[in-house]
């Protein structure tokens, strides 16, 4: 039975040209995390596998950094980075848990004036 829950940073905004940390946390389960995927709806950004370590997609190699922890740092943000990001926790014996983060990348002047969801 899957008892765990994924906590995420939820809806976040960041400045164009800046960076953001995408972070999820799996709680309420003793299941072992064996792999975490970071994905958009149409493509994979990165995988952190307990045995193989980190894999970063070539499409994001120049501006994605692994971590902190199982999170992902997205750098040199553009407005095209606006959208939904999924953290997919592969666990044993529970199975797969999915969390989501919506990122809005704002023009600098807008971000400076404290845009909020």
């Amino acid at each position: 039975m899957m008892t765990g829950t994924i906590e995420t940073t939820g809806n976040i905004s960041a400045e164009k040209g800046g960076s953001i940390i995408l972070q999820c946390h799996l709680s309420s389960t003793t299941a072992q995390v064996t792999q975490v995927n970071w994905e958009q709806q149409d493509q994979l950004l990165a995988i952190c596998n307990a045995d193989l370590g980190w894999h970063i997609s070539p499409s994001f190699k120049d501006r994605v950094a692994p971590g902190p922890g199982l999170g992902l740092t997205l750098q040199s943000l553009t407005v095209n980075d606006t959208g939904e990001y999924f953290c997919i926790y592969h666990t044993y014996p529970d199975g797969t848990y999915t969390g989501r983060i919506f990122l809005e990348v704002l023009e600098s002047s807008v971000a400076e004036h404290g845009a909020r969801f």
Epitope: Q35, N37, E39, Q41, D42, Q43, L44, I47, N49, L52, H55, S57, S59, E84, F86, I88, H90, T96, T98
Partner: antibody, heavy 118, light 107 residues
Framework: DVQLQESGPGLVKPSQTLSLTCTVT?????????WNWIRQPPGKGLEWMGY???????RYNPSLKSRITISRDTSKNQFSLKLSSVTAEDTATYYC???????????WGQGTLVTVSS | DIQMTQSPSSLSASVGDRVTITCRAS??????VAWYQQKPGQAPRLLIY???YRYTGVPDRFSGSGSGTDFTLTISSLQAEDVAVYYC?????????FGQGTKLEIK
């Protein structure tokens, strides 16, 4: 339980537009996931055609991009495929399927055979 | 597009045999590979995702392994009901592509 069911004409004439609908029961197509079309010509392999996500954005296989449109009718919990300018090469069993996280296909319709012939 | 190449295209084995099907991706897809079983007249059925994770309800005689470009589906002890065509699929990015299939028969 989630169920998907394809419907539409089994015979389409060359140069016309193929239109199919997938009716989803047991889950709202606006709640989550991406809703896909995958086809399989007789005796051949599988080809991913495209999807419409729960938020309404579509993504297509570049090999079909100029001919394909996937849309949805949220009031009926249906999504649809339109493929224009069909030829005999488009004869296939067409499946609708739900994409999971990660992007595997765990739920499929039973498939519907569409023959392109005059 | 990422191409997926399966081998063999067909194979015949006896009940109880250990069967291995391989799939090679044209570029590094890390562990983003799924395996399906398709029986005649039916839709494909998901067996394995993320290279080695068995989907809910799939018998434990099915296992997957591999990373990067080389992947394997193994049936540890072949059963009569495993006669089917098996497909690999990468789930790395769109367009998702499938291998050409491996037809498995019983000797």
């Amino acid at each position: 339980d989630v169920q998907l069911q394809e419907s539409g004409p089994g015979l389409v004439k060359p140069s016309q537009t193929l239109s199919l609908t997938c009716t989803v029961t047991g889950y709202s197509i606006t709640s989550d996931y991406a809703w896909n079309w995958i086809r399989q010509p007789p005796g051949k392999g599988l080809e991913w055609m495209g999807y419409i996500s729960y938020s309404g954005s579509a993504r297509y296989n570049p090999s079909l991009k100029s001919r394909i449109t996937i849309s949805r009718d949220t009031s009926k919990n249906q999504f649809s495929l339109k493929l224009s300018s069909v030829t005999a090469e488009d004869t296939a069993t067409y499946y609708c399927a739900r994409k999971g996280y990660p992007a595997y296909f765990a739920y499929w319709g039973q498939g519907t055979l569409v023959t392109v012939s005059s | 597009d990422i191409q997926m190449t399966q081998s063999p295209s067909s194979l015949s084995a006896s009940v109880g045999d250990r069967v291995t099907i391989t799939c090679r991706a044209s570029q590094d897809v890390s562990t983003a590979v799924a395996w399906y079983q398709q029986k005649p007249g039916q839709a494909p059925r998901l067996l394995i995702y993320s290279a080695s994770y068995r989907y809910t309800g799939v018998p434990d005689r099915f296992s997957g392994s591999g990373s990067g470009t080389d992947f394997t589906l193994t049936i540890s002890s072949l059963q009569a009901e495993d006669v089917a065509v098996y497909y690999c699929q990468h789930h790395y990015s769109t367009p998702y592509t499938f291998g050409q299939g491996t037809k498995l028969e019983i000797k």
